[in-house]
């Protein structure tokens, strides 16, 4: 039995600067003035982050077809970024033995890259999301997924384990991104934020979303997963936005009627098993790619990302209840558990379907097979 | 290179409290769960439960009742109470860790201690 | 609680000889299958996990298959500090639960 804890009037933070905060976060001090227990030191020798435009900025928007009821992430307005404060890299500590599972957290000391230096790499995830700046790769086909409507045994184990909500996924949940790029789902879990503050990983045009799951696969290729890691295309996620809509979604309601049980850092249940291609978008025609990194420690790249361009519509209540209900590290609220997005060196996403328009056209020149020219380059 | 190391009396009396330390060594006792596994003599391993180093805690049904685990981090210990024993709860008594994949969530008990015998006997 | 059945109880080998060792559980229980080996007086040691995948450090002659329901040890070919007592654990649920063992004895 877990015994009452007084709630964090300014819960664990974890990627948010404040300037990505909707509503009520004008009465925080600057991260100059007063930084916050959470937020590192300095972060000097870190990457930078991309500049984002305040959410604020950002009009309301509406779903684009009321039978469909989710948003698509070219509904966005496209915002030039104003050159917003940089957001405060997430950082880990580690045990000073330095074991091989290293024990981090969101917004402490030491940096992440301490923990492990892939953190440091130049193609890092999450990222932010420029639609007009993605380039269109007709090559990029639905994907497919196989195996994933699960009967109710075994039943699947679901982990509080201090980071996340984690689902660990059974063998034979196949995911192909094309021909010869086959997969296995190995666990899914989720990244939120807190009330009133979404807690998206990846952003679009700058707008962070309430919620995001991350369904992480194994490339058939590799048996293993510590032989995948940092190889290219060694590792997927299939990445979908969480928003608000005006009803209960009765799949992720399968899990979260059960985070009460774990609500303890470490805890654990079991759950009967379930369709997990209905936490996913139904659209899987329509997504974003490109490769980047693992959001958490090792931070391993070569990791291909795939987001959905249709996001999923939870209920108030539902958002709440991932976000307001769990506990993490020393006796505060697992909240805000996301990564402030990285730069793209150079990196270019890409589009399984036309989400930009190209307001400047270029002459034809040779492109080479399979690539694809970034529109507005 | 992690290690574990089984502390206690070897003897303990019926309906007795039977209580085991488990010290750490090599490595934190943070970001795993450390479990307490028995084994009868001549006979076969019995998972008695765990604790995460954050004090949350599972235990077998069959000894719920009985069992108390806790966890000192300072110390980098965790320690096993067992109430009102009898006879059958002599054994061999591990502490292992148990490990586990935050990638995949895969989970086994990859560290032991060497062991400690209890017998309960007046 | 899931049940875990191991067959056989014990079994007499060479060195050199292929050994396979089976357990099977009560309900399925997926891939969470551990196979450890223990010597007398000693504790168990962690061989496979996850039904298939080799523990680092141990001799790849060990392996492992199997999914759901029953699952399988092989040792490729014997060598003389084989000689031991296998135990699978279920991972799928809790309680964790452990075959009763297989005795692996020199013919």
């Known amino acids: 039995q877990r015994l009452p804890r007084m709630q964090e009037d300014s819960p664990l933070g974890g990627g948010s600067s404040g300037e990505d905060d909707p509503l009520g976060e004008e009465d925080l001090p600057s991260e100059e003035d007063s930084p916050r227990e959470e937020d590192p030191p300095g972060e000097e020798d870190l990457p930078g982050e991309e500049d984002l435009p305040g959410e604020e900025d950002l009009p309301e928007v509406k779903p684009k077809s009321e039978e469909e009821g989710s948003l698509k992430l070219e509904d966005l307005p496209t915002v030039e970024a104003p050159g917003d404060p940089q957001e405060p890299q997430n950082n880990a500590h580690r045990d000073k033995e330095g074991d091989d599972q290293s024990h981090w957290r969101y917004g402490g000391d030491p940096p992440w890259p301490r923990v492990s230096p892939a953190c440091a790499g130049r193609f890092q995830s999450p990222v932010d999301i420029r639609p007009q700046l993605a380039a269109f790769c007709p090559a990029l086909r639905p994907l497919e997924l196989l195996g994933f409507q699960l009967p109710p045994l075994p039943e699947l184990r679901l982990r509080n384990n201090g980071h996340s909500v984690q689902l660990t996924l059974p063998p034979g949940l196949e995911m192909a991104l094309g021909p010869g790029r086959e997969y296995r789902a190995l666990q899914l879990h989720l990244h939120w934020g807190a009330a009133g503050r979404p807690g998206s990983e990846h952003t679009v045009e700058g707008h962070r979303f309430p919620a995001e799951i991350h369904v992480v696969h194994l490339s058939t290729a590799f048996a293993r997963v510590d032989e995948a890691l940092g190889r290219p295309g060694g590792l997927a996620v299939l990445a979908a936005f969480l928003e608000e809509g005006p009803e209960e979604n009765s799949a992720y309601e399968q899990l979260l009627s059960r985070l009460e049980e774990i609500a303890e850092e470490g805890s654990e249940t079991q759950v009967p098993g379930l369709d997990i291609s209905a936490l996913l978008p139904s659209d899987f025609s329509r997504y974003f790619q490109y490769e980047g990194s693992l959001t958490t420690p090792p931070c391993a790249q070569g990791v291909i990302w795939t987001v959905f361009n249709q996001t999923v519509m939870l209920s108030a209540k539902q958002l709440h209840t991932l976000s307001d209900t769990l506990w993490g590290p020393g006796d505060s609220r697992l909240q805000l558990n996301f990564r402030a997005t990285q730069p793209l060196n150079g990196r270019v996403i890409e589009a399984s379907f036309p989400a930009g328009v190209d307001s400047s056209p270029r002459a034809a020149e040779p492109v080479q097979l399979n690539s694809c020219l970034a529109a507005g380059d | 290179q992690v290690q574990l190391q089984e502390s206690g009396p070897g003897l303990v009396k019926p309906s007795e409290t039977l209580s085991l330390t488990c010290t750490v060594s090599g490595g934190s006792i943070s970001s795993y769960y450390w479990s307490w596994i028995r084994q009868p003599p001549g006979k076969g391993l019995e998972w008695i439960g765990y604790?995460?180093?954050?004090?949350?805690?599972n235990y077998n049904p069959s000894l719920k009742s009985r069992v108390t685990i806790s966890v000192d981090t300072s110390k980098n210990q965790f320690s096993l109470k067992l109430s009102s024993v009898t006879a059958a709860d002599t054994a061999v008594y591990y502490c292992?860790?148990?490990?586990?994949?935050?990638?995949?969530?895969?989970?086994?008990?990859?560290?032991w201690g060497q062991g400690t015998l209890v017998t309960v006997s007046s | 609680d899931i049940q875990m059945t191991q067959s056989p109880s014990s079994v007499s080998a060479s060195v050199g000889d292929r050994v396979t060792i089976t357990c099977r559980a009560s309900?399925?229980?997926?891939?969470?299958l551990t196979w450890y080996q223990q010597k007398p007086g000693k504790a168990p040691k962690l061989l496979i996990y996850a039904a298939s995948s080799l523990q680092s450090g141990v001799p790849s002659r060990f392996s492992g298959s199997g999914s759901g329901t029953d699952f399988t040890l092989t040792i490729s070919s014997l060598q003389p500090e084989d000689f031991a007592t296998y135990y699978c654990q279920q991972a799928n649920s809790f309680p964790i639960t452990f075959g009763q063992g297989t005795r692996l004895e020199i013919k």
């Open positions: 309900q399925g229980i997926s891939i969470w």
């Open positions: 292992a860790r148990r490990g586990y994949d935050i990638l995949t969530g895969y989970d086994y008990f990859d560290y």
């Open positions: 604790i995460y180093y954050s004090g949350s805690t």
